[in-house]
């Protein structure tokens, strides 16, 4: 009779975390009589996964009834797989012996790899705002994935970025891995509505990448432009001067009118007009009673935006 | 010697569409000599999947070298699985015969089920806008999933909806399935920023449901409220009357001022103020030269919003 063979038909099995893994094993003969055991790993440090003869293995179920006399199928199913279960599993036939059973023959082994999904990527931006034409850094982090192979891309709106650096840790074998990437983004005036997107592709995601986003609105400060103009006279002896504060972000803005250097009125912008690009406009107007002035008046519109140093624009009002 | 057994250790195997399926099969003896074949299904209509002896099976690879003299492992791998591959696969041993080989023994069969992901859900809303307190319908559709079991929920913002009806087609067995659901949503004035979400859970999604969204902003019309008020006089002989047009959506709005029923000025709203709830406000003002009027004046602010019938509010200006 042909000598018993231990057949482990699958060289490798890949299972998603949380699922069950079935490891196939069949004997080609009932003899020599003796139990089978499953181990993870080989050599002295191998870990017992299942012993047909004795012990309690709550996560392991046998596919066939191993107590049946003519059973040759010793496949097992391991429930609730985690990345820590990855490794090579050996189905080992023992022959009966005294005082101990003797290892007789091992299967070729089945490598179990565990597919664990990356956590949702978390994107974080700079601690302080920067103005257009400056460069800011965004980081993207995700953890707990396996296998190690992962692809990370950065986008600003729909456009792929190239200035970034990515690390996957640890460098060696591990039950699961983490990724950390830093992208450098040059701000433009139109970036209030812009987003940076960190996109990760992994075998567990079946072609649907995970995305983490951050709004550049949290990272940008667009300083206002000021324009002071005189409006057509609505009534005699009255001049209507407006200060158009344009294209600023974020909202926080305080405006002070000065007449010949003296504070005339201070206002905090409230009902702002939002532009399509997400910046804001605001207009303030000053009615000047020309009867009260003999000489020309210098009107100054002074704006303090988002806690920054004030900017101003002046207008010389001719008293005719 | 014990008679040859055909061992198919796995009763069932579940594979994601696009992956490969490994079907395990082992013989317990080299005799009787003869080839093996794999079939899908049993009986007269069974479909040949692999023939060790002859034929071309581009999607099938053998796990072991079947030409090796003492090979007892006849496991196969089928690549690029689609829902159409679902079924029960039998590993069948033939013994050599003349003129034809004779079927000798079949394995117990392995049922292959294919997990196919639902397509991204597409949510569509009503063709015409409706006003608050009215009910509108949204539909959600997804296709191509397997197995048939699927769970669909509707949410308005974070709150689960109960008024919906869902169908999964076809009712009988199929390689893949489609889902169609219709939800009825009662609009409220604050719904410009609201979303309806169609959420689908399926075994292939590993606990991350697919979501389709629609914005109620596409389905709602919030008519404006009008308020006409007189502002403090900036100059003698001038009355400043404002028309505050509040909480309307969408943007499209035309305003006409009438003095004693005669058109004074028509404006199209452009620079609007956006409220937190997504509705818009706009203010128009009219400077009335009281010198030109002997008697009281009735000023009317008439607004046409989003192509609907005009609404108006009047104000009696007393000429003192």
């Amino acid at each position: 009779e042909d000598e018993l063979q231990v057949i482990q038909p699958e060289k490798s099995v890949s299972v998603a975390a949380g699922e069950s893994a079935t490891l196939c094993c069949a004997m080609t003969s009932l003899i020599p009589v003796g139990p089978i055991m499953w181990f993870r790993g080989a050599g002295a440090g191998r870990e017992l996964i299942y012993n047909q003869k004795e012990g309690h293995f709550p996560r392991v179920t046998t596919v066939s009834e191993l107590t049946k006399r003519n059973n040759l199928d010793f496949s097992i199913s391991i429930s609730n797989i985690t990345p820590a279960d990855a490794g090579t599993y050996y189905c080992v036939k023992f022959r009966k012996g005294s005082p101990d059973d003797v290892e007789f023959k091992s299967g070729a082994g089945t490598e179990l790899s565990v597919r664990a999904k990356p956590s949702a990527p978390v994107v974080s931006g700079p601690a302080v705002r920067a103005t257009p034409e400056h460069t800011v850094s965004f980081t993207c982090e995700s953890h707990g994935f396996s296998p190690r192979d992962i692809t990370l891309k950065w986008f600003k709106n729909g456009n792929e970025l190239s200035d970034f650096q990515t690390n996957v840790d640890p460098a060696g074998d591990s039950v699961s891995y983490s990724i950390h990437s830093t992208a450098r983004v040059v701000l433009t005036r139109g970036d209030v509505h812009s987003q940076v997107i960190c996109e990760m592709a992994h075998i567990t995601l079946q072609g649907d990448p995970l995305r983490g986003t951050a709004n550049l609105s949290e990272a940008i400060r667009v300083p206002p432009t000021l324009e002071v103009t005189q409006q057509p006279m609505r009534a005699e002896n009255q001049a209507n001067v407006t200060c158009q504060v344009s294209n600023f972000y974020p909202r926080g803005l305080q405006l002070t009118w000065l007449e010949n250097g003296n504070v005339s009125r201070t206002e905090t912008a409230s009902t702002l007009i939002e532009n399509k690009d997400g910046t804001y406009n605001w207009m303030s107007w000053l009615l000047v009673n020309t009867c009260a002035h003999r000489d020309d008046v210098v009107l100054t519109c002074q704006v303090e935006h988002d806690g920054q140093q004030a900017v101003s624009k002046s207008y010389a009002l001719e008293i005719s | 010697e014990d008679e040859l057994q055909v061992i198919q250790p796995e009763k069932s195997v579940s594979v994601a569409a696009g992956e490969s399926a490994t079907l395990c099969c082992a013989m317990t003896s080299l005799i009787p000599v003869g080839p093996i074949m794999w079939f899908r299904g049993a009986g007269a209509g069974r479909e040949l999947i692999y023939n060790q002896k002859e034929g071309h099976f581009p999607r099938v690879t053998t796990v072991s070298e079947l030409t090796k003299r003492n090979n007892l492992d006849f496991s196969i791998s089928i690549s690029n699985i689609t829902p159409a591959d679902a079924g029960t696969y039998y590993c069948v041993k033939f013994r050599k015969g003349s003129p034809d080989d004779v079927e000798f023994k079949s394995g117990a069969g392995t049922e292959l089920s294919v997990r196919a992901k639902p397509s991204a859900p597409v949510v569509s809303g009503p063709a015409v806008r409706a006003t608050p307190e009215h009910t509108v319908s949204f539909t959600c559709e997804s296709h191509g999933f397997s197995p048939r079991d699927i769970t669909l929920k509707w949410f308005k913002n974070g709150n689960e909806l109960s008024d919906f009806q869902t169908n999964v087609d076809p009712a009988g067995d199929s390689v893949s399935y489609s889902i169609h659901s219709t939800a009825r949503v009662v609009l409220t004035r604050g719904d410009v920023h609201s979303q309806v979400i169609c959420e689908m859970a399926h075994i292939t999604l590993q606990g991350d449901p697919l979501r389709g969204t629609a914005n109620l902003s596409e389905a709602i019309r919030v008519p404006p409220t009008l308020e006409v008020t007189q502002q403090p006089m900036r100059a003698e002989n001038q009355a400043n009357v404002t028309c505050q047009v509040s909480n309307f959506y969408p943007r499209g709005l035309q305003l006409t001022w009438l003095e004693n029923g005669n058109v004074s000025r028509t404006e199209t709203a452009s620079t609007l103020i956006e409220n937190k709830d997504g509705t818009y406000n706009w203010m128009s003002w009219l400077l009335v030269n009281t010198c030109a009027h002997r008697d009281d004046v009735v000023l009317t602010c008439q607004v046409e919003h989003d192509g609907q019938q005009a609404v108006s509010k009047s104000y009696a200006l007393e000429i003192s």
């Epitope: 009932l30 020599p32 009589v33 139990p35 089978i36 047909q52 003869k53 004795e54 022959r95 | 010697e1």
Partner: antibody, heavy 120, light 107 residues
Framework: QVQLVQSGAEVKKPGASVKVSCKAS????????ISWVRQAPGQGLEWMGW????????NYAQKLQGRVTMTTDTSTSTAYMELRSLRSDDTAVYYC?????????????WGRGTLVTVSS | DIQMTQSPSSVSASVGDRVTITCRAS??????LAWYQQKPGKAPKLLIY???NLQSGVPSRFSGSGSGTDFTLTISSLQPEDFATYYC?????????FGGGTKVEIK
């Protein structure tokens, strides 16, 4: 067919030795261990020991240690049990039995038994 | 050594009766218990192995149950050929031990 054929009855004097044979046929002899079980007249079953030709392993009951030897001859598919220094309480029917459990011990095939009488 | 205690030591029953024999191990033996039938002048015959598995060729009126320390052999409907002595045997470890036997007699 699958069977175990034992040697004939023996009458022995106290202090003598007896060697009982058990010939296997119809199956692969080296594949299965053989146990020896005895039964004194009107008594229950008593396990004596075990031998596995595959590795030459043996295991004997403590009370018989030093008096019993079990051997096999794979060329003739025969198992032997020799019991020395016989006493009157060794009078019994001696059975050989094939042991078939993979993780456990049970006996699915028995010889017909050999009566050994120890009498002065 | 693992002691096996069988009860009752004898039972009188009639054809068609349901007969139950119990066996207790002095320590846990998982499911590694066998049941044998022996008739006078004959070798024992294996009925049940691994506590509940019916040996090939044995009628289905015989069944076994139990695990750990307590086991039962049941004959669902006693037939004339079933009058015999029944032994349990632990197969968990050396030395292999048998119960004292239960004699099933005609009432």
């Amino acid at each position: 067919q699958v069977q175990l054929v034992q040697s004939g009855a023996e009458v022995k004097k106290p202090g003598a030795s007896v060697k009982v044979s058990c010939k296997a046929s119809g199956y692969t002899f080296t594949g299965y261990p053989i146990s020896w079980v005895r039964q004194a007249p009107g008594q229950g079953l008593e396990w004596m020991g075990w031998i596995y030709a595959y590795g030459g392993n043996t295991n004997y009951a403590q009370k018989l240690q030093g008096r019993v030897t079990m051997t096999t001859d794979t060329s003739t598919s025969t198992a032997y049990m020799e019991l020395r220094s016989l006493r009157s309480d060794d009078t019994a029917v001696y059975y050989c039995a094939r042991e078939a459990g993979s993780s456990w011990y049970d006996f699915d095939l028995w010889g017909r038994g050999t009566l050994v009488t120890v009498s002065s | 050594d693992i002691q096996m205690t069988q009860s009752p030591s004898s039972v009188s029953a009639s054809v068609g009766d349901r007969v139950t024999i119990t066996c207790r191990a002095s320590q846990g033996i998982s499911s590694w218990l066998a049941w044998y039938q022996q008739k006078p002048g004959k070798a024992p015959k294996l009925l049940i192995y691994a506590a509940s598995n019916l040996q090939s060729g044995v009628p289905s009126r015989f069944s076994g149950s139990g695990s750990g320390t307590d086991f039962t052999l049941t004959i669902s409907s006693l037939q004339p050929e079933d009058f015999a002595t029944y032994y349990c045997q632990q197969g968990a470890s050396f030395p292999i031990t048998f119960g004292g036997g239960t004699k099933v007699e005609i009432k």
